[in-house]
């Protein structure tokens, strides 16, 4: 039996800059019942506060609802582990909510086979930003990637589209079925998961010409 090992805050994420969650790895419990508490302060402020909600985001987490989330302020967050033999505190984690956004994937993915005047066929991929993000006002600047592969292929082909919400894919094989997904990433933030898979078959009666 011993004091608890040092916990580590390993991840903080926000879906929308309005709420966020931080998760920690507990470290060893020293073979004893161990309590964990997360405390935080904000830069330039002297007060220290305890986690407002340990339940919403599951074990070893702290959820900050709208009421407790400020942007343009750096949070200094630590986790303390205590058992009857002693206590241990994590290194402080400095968090700016505007840098930890992991949005929902883009929505309304649409696929359309089109043909140019020279009879060259392409797949026109279009999508919309995730619902939660207010891209028009510049509250979020979003970058996108699409990935596609034929049903038989093992590897995805990834295209970075910048801020564009549409993309044309050329040199596809007639008669093949293609799977397509999109994801997005805000400035400074994290890539969303890949969105729902859509598929389309390139018709055989379109002829590809180089």
């Amino acid at each position: 039996q011993s004091p608890p090992g040092k916990p580590e805050i390993h991840k903080c994420r926000s879906p929308d800059k309005e709420t966020f969650t931080c998760w920690w790895n507990p470290g060893s419990d020293g073979g004893l019942p161990t309590n964990y508490s997360l405390t935080y302060s904000k830069e330039g402020e002297k007060n220290t506060y305890e986690c407002p909600d340990y339940k919403t985001s599951g074990p070893n987490s702290c959820f900050f609802s709208k009421q407790y989330t400020s942007i343009w302020k750096i949070y200094i967050i630590t986790v303390n582990a205590t058992n009857e033999m002693g206590s241990s505190t994590s290194d402080p984690l400095y968090v700016d909510v505007t840098y930890i956004v992991e949005p929902e994937p883009p929505r309304n993915l649409t696929l359309e086979v089109k043909q140019l005047k020279d009879k060259k066929t392409y797949l026109w991929v279009k999508w919309l930003p995730p619902t939660i993000t207010d891209v028009k006002t510049g509250w979020f600047t979003m970058e996108y990637e699409i990935r596609l592969k034929s049903e038989e292929a093992d590897e995805w082909e990834i295209h970075f589209t910048g801020h564009q919400t549409q993309f044309k894919v050329f040199d596809l094989y007639p008669g093949q079925k293609y799977l397509v997904q999109t994801r997005c990433k805000p400035d400074h933030g994290y890539w969303s998961r890949w969105g729902q898979e859509k598929s389309i078959e390139i018709p055989n009666d379109f002829t590809l010409k180089d």
Epitope: H10, K11, C12, G44, L93, Y99
Partner: antibody
Framework: QVQLQQPGAELVMPGSSVKLSCKAS????????MHWVKQRPGQGLEWIGE????????NYNQKFKDKATLTVDKSSSTAYMQLSSLTSEDSAVYYC?????????????WGQGTLVTVSA | DIVMTQSQKFMSTTVGDRVSITCKAS??????VAWYQQKPGQSPKLLIY???NRYTGVPDRFTDSGSGTDFTLTISNLQSEDLADYFC?????????FGGGTKLEIK
Amino acid sequence: QVQLQQPGAELVMPGSSVKLSCKASGYTFTTYWMHWVKQRPGQGLEWIGEIDPSDSYSNYNQKFKDKATLTVDKSSSTAYMQLSSLTSEDSAVYYCARNGGLGPAWFSYWGQGTLVTVSA
Amino acid sequence: DIVMTQSQKFMSTTVGDRVSITCKASQYVGTAVAWYQQKPGQSPKLLIYSASNRYTGVPDRFTDSGSGTDFTLTISNLQSEDLADYFCQQYSSYPWTFGGGTKLEIK
């Protein structure tokens, strides 16, 4: 405790490439962005670029876009920077530096630096 | 690119002095400025972030004032271990840039 381990020195030929390593320990490698900074003898500091070890997303200083390539190996918690087409201008100390938190780019932990000498 | 100018390359000081090191940004950077200390043969060490916040473990004799384009790192009651190079850095817009450094020397 947090440590960023870098080899002390590399002697390389002009025109060749070198791959510098930075082994991180004492924290979860994928949590923080890693940066690379150049310092020529007796001179100031120049930011080369940054990489997010969680997904290898990177940003570069345009000045180093064709010179440096940043990669990571999550399994060994190691960040790498490859420098290509080396000239005497590339002789410098190169530091890896960990982002201070989940936020803006200030650097709370630095490696000891690798001195790269480009010489025939 | 934003240029960070530290006009004093060298400053002669005495132990116990109050020293002010200045840094000027070529464009508005808000409070997105950090300060580092570098001793000979060592890597830089973070002192201040967000223009005025001392990093964990940094003695309170180090303070920063300023926002916008003009920043000053003040060391009160200078200690011999404070003799080093000091660099400012902006992280307001890419690429992140550093000042040229100010070296504190003994008179």
